[in-house]
């Protein structure tokens, strides 16, 4: 039967008709009393006093209503829920996830989890209505939990007309024996204790740290992972795990050398809605590693679009060497990540200046052999690009990656729709092409142009008449990615390099073969 419920927009909690609740007012000491009336929450301020007994976890401040028994918790940053029991920064689960209190709410099938307080779950063995719900992590939310000591966090989802349990796709903190961090590392509980400069971390309980905020003496030390150890942590929501160090007898802090757990090659792909000559209009969230490189020219004012690029780590962009033949000074270059429209700023875009760029020293500007370049983004810290749904690294391929001939892959870029067009595309495009066998990627197939072992070919193999809209890269796409699915992740196979025209039948595009440059990439990205 259809039920009227209210959803509190501030907390995303759900309430039944006529149910009442208290909620804190953000950035103030006020508390509001709300009740659910015909699907709308009606709220007004009420007087409160400090709670007579502690009821809030993780350093939350408890206040109870003056004239009735309900209470509310003012949660410190990073925590939420009725009793501040939800850790909004937990990006992965440990062991089986019994203690996981994060906010992942997607099942393995991609379905959204159901709120544990939903009346549809009232008869289920595990719901937010249980007397021990808080202890089990259940409540007025739809986050994945493992209340029954199963193998990993799960939730109820509505499918095939009924509610059934399904495991969640929550990342596990330690995959194999990797010691790495997710997100900004506030949930990192590993044992790295060296900084990026190689200095040893000071123990968090060291006497030298007296007077510092983040030490083993902090009231929330346990929740923050601080204690009688010198392991890297991120207690203050910084960019990544860090620790206190002594440098030249001076107390300071440094970021740690903990590797980030890779989320490379993962994305929220949405089916393109619009066909366009040479490909399909796309959203940046489908190609979050796509970069747009702009250059200031000595002769003309302002910046103009130069080439595509590929985000391969927080501070490094891969591109094509031929894009930099004008030898721009690095400060004349700008890199934009997270942009769908070529010249229209995106809501979540990230813009960077370039610290330096490295063009392969054996790049041949006649044949485009070794057509590869690296750009280092400028940043005040050791991190540059912040991961989001529209900005994410692509995976570099394993050295021995050999995909079958005719594997379907995709490229993206802001390049022209066709060779004779005077303009670049106003919007990001994607194109679907297949990898050609090396026997079909030779000089004789490309008008006697030199084709080396550092190149690979890919093209649209559909048969088409003169009006066929064959997918291909085109001018302006150079430096962008050719990616293929490998082990469930989009993996960089080629860098858009050159071609004869665009979208011609039986004429593939030519790409820099990335597997030939893995050692070169590693070598040049060294700290």
């Amino acid at each position: 039967s259809y039920q009227v419920i209210c959803r509190d927009e501030k907390t995303q909690m759900i309430y039944q008709q006529h149910q009442s609740w208290l909620r804190p007012v953000l950035r103030s000491n006020r508390v509001e009393y709300c009740w659910c009336n015909s699907g709308r929450a009606q709220c007004h301020s009420v007087p409160v006093k400090s709670c007579s007994e502690p009821r809030c976890f993780n350093g939350g401040t408890c206040q109870q209503a003056l004239y009735f028994s309900d209470f509310v918790c003012q949660c410190p940053e990073g925590f939420a829920g009725k009793c501040c029991e939800i850790d909004t920064r937990a990006t992965c689960y440990e062991d089986q996830g019994i203690s996981y209190r994060g906010t992942w709410s997607t099942a393995e099938s991609g379905a959204e989890c159901t709120n544990w307080n939903s009346s549809a779950l009232a008869q289920k063995p595990y719901s937010g209505r249980r007397p021990d719900a808080i202890r089990l992590g259940l409540g007025n939310h739809n986050y994945c939990r493992n209340p029954d000591r199963d193998s990993k966090p799960w939730c109820y989802v509505f499918k095939a007309g009924k509610y059934s349990s399904e495991f969640c796709s929550t990342p596990a903190c330690s995959e194999g024996n990797s010691d790495c961090y997710f997100g900004n590392g506030s949930a990192y509980r590993g044992t790295h204790s060296l900084t990026e400069s190689g200095a040893s971390c000071l123990p968090w309980n060291s006497m030298i740290l007296i007077g510092k905020v983040y030490t083993a003496q902090n009231p929330s030390a346990q929740a923050l992972g601080l204690g009688k150890h010198n392991y890297c942590r991120n207690p203050d929501g910084d960019a990544k795990p860090w620790c206190h160090v002594l440098k030249n007898r001076r107390l300071t802090w440094e970021y740690c050398d903990v590797p980030s757990c890779s989320t490379c090659g993962l994305r929220q792909y949405s089916q393109p809605q619009f066909r366009i000559k040479g490909g399909l209009f796309a959203d940046i969230a489908s190609h979050p590693w796509q970069a747009a490189i702009f250059a200031k020219h000595r002769r003309s004012p302002g910046e103009r679009f130069l080439c595509g690029g590929i985000l391969i780590s927080s501070c490094w962009i891969l591109s094509a060497a031929h894009c930099f033949q004008e030898r721009f000074p690095p400060h004349h270059l700008t890199v934009i990540l997270g942009r769908t429209y070529r010249v229209v700023p995106g809501e979540e875009e990230q813009k960077f200046e370039v610290e330096k760029y490295i063009v392969h020293k054996e790049f041949d500007d006649d044949t485009y052999d070794n057509d590869i370049a690296l750009l280092q983004l400028k940043s005040d810290s050791s991190r540059c690009a912040q991961e989001s749904s529209v900005v994410r690294t692509v995976c570099l391929p394993p050295a021995d990656l050999q995909l079958p001939d005719w594997t379907e892959c995709e490229l993206s870029g802001y390049g022209k729709h066709e060779a004779l067009s005077p303009f670049y595309s106003e919007r990001l495009k994607e194109a679907h092409v297949r990898l050609y066998p090396s026997s079909r990627c030779t000089s004789q197939h490309l008008l006697n142009r030199t084709v080396t072992d550092n190149m690979l070919c890919a093209g649209d193999t559909r048969s088409g008449g003169p009006q066929a809209n064959l997918h291909d890269a085109c001018q302006g796409d150079s430096g962008g990615p050719l990616v293929c699915l490998n082990d469930g992740r989009m993996t960089l196979v080629g860098i858009i390099s050159w071609g004869l025209g665009c979208g011609q039948k039986d004429v593939p595009g030519v790409y820099t073969k990335v597997t030939n440059y893995l050692d070169w990439i590693r070598d040049n990205m060294r700290p």
């Epitope: 010691d179 570099l396 590693r522 070598d523 040049n524």
Partner: antibody, heavy 114, light 112 residues
Framework: QVQLVQSGAEVKKPGASVKVSCKAS??????INWIRQATGQGLEWMGR????????GYAQKFQGRVTMTRDTSISTAYMELSSLRSEDTAVYYC?????????WGQGTLVTVSS | DVVMTQSPLSLPVTPGEPASISCRSS???????????LDWYLQKPGQSPQLLIY???NRASGVPDRFSGSGSGTDFTLKISRVEAEDVGVYYC?????????FGGGTKVEIK
């Protein structure tokens, strides 16, 4: 911290191959390098392997004779040297590179003798 | 290949006195990414080598501040301000800028 533990000493005949292993614990972010040292001699760099992607770079002197591989599931790197000759008798070290070769294995003595 | 030449070959020292080792490369060892990967390693008798100085002048973790590195281009120096008995061993300079990476021939530091 990174710890590197190498396999035990080997005695091989000329023309044979030897495969030395190096098990890593901790963050081996960049490369595992292989360096050798003949008795009473200096250090000689042989090559490197990226433990993640498996890409390699070898010294020209060993090209065609050396193969560096890794098994990520057990965090182990391997160095195989083929067509052994008496002058390959040496202690073979693995060393992990981050900003330099900050961590070294204990060394593996390979003796080539008929 | 880049040849790294160290001098002296042998260095007898008195505890408490300073010591200096020179290392010269046959060509510039500035990497294409702008860094100079010149390191110093110490191999104590019967042990694996250990890192002392990386990228010309940065002291590795746990290395006493009596060790310092300097230089640029092709000329580099390792200095020990006051030698201690535990500093004996063979010191190697090393370039990691151009493949093949190469070590100097080594300088043996011993107590007089």
């Amino acid at each position: 911290q990174v710890q590197l533990v190498q396999s035990g000493a080997e005695v091989k005949k000329p023309g044979a191959s030897v495969k030395v292993s190096c098990k890593a614990s901790g963050n081996t972010s960049y490369w595992i390098n292989w360096i050798r040292q003949a008795t009473g001699q200096g250090l000689e760099w042989m090559g490197r392997i990226d433990p993640g992607g498996g890409s390699t770079g070898y010294a020209q002197k060993f090209q065609g004779r050396v193969t560096m591989t890794r098994d990520t599931s057990i965090s182990t790197a391997y160095m195989e040297l083929s067509s052994l000759r008496s002058e390959d008798t040496a202690v073979y070290y693995c060393a992990s590179y981050y900003y330099a070769m900050a961590y070294w294995g204990q060394g593996t003595l390979v003796t080539v003798s008929s | 290949d880049v040849v790294m030449t160290q001098s002296p070959l042998s260095l007898p020292v008195t505890p408490g006195e300073p010591a200096s080792i020179s290392c010269r490369s046959s060509q510039s060892i500035v990497h294409s990414n702008g860094n100079t990967y010149l390191d110093w390693y110490l191999q104590k008798p019967g042990q694996s080598p250990q890192l002392l100085i990386y990228k010309v002048s940065n002291r590795a973790s746990g290395v006493p501040d009596r060790f310092s590195g300097s230089g640029s281009g092709t000329d580099f120096t390792l200095k020990i301000s006051r030698v201690e008995a535990e500093d004996v061993g063979v010191y190697y300079c090393f370039q990691g800028s151009h493949v093949p990476w190469t070590f100097g021939g080594g300088t043996k530091v011993e107590i007089k």
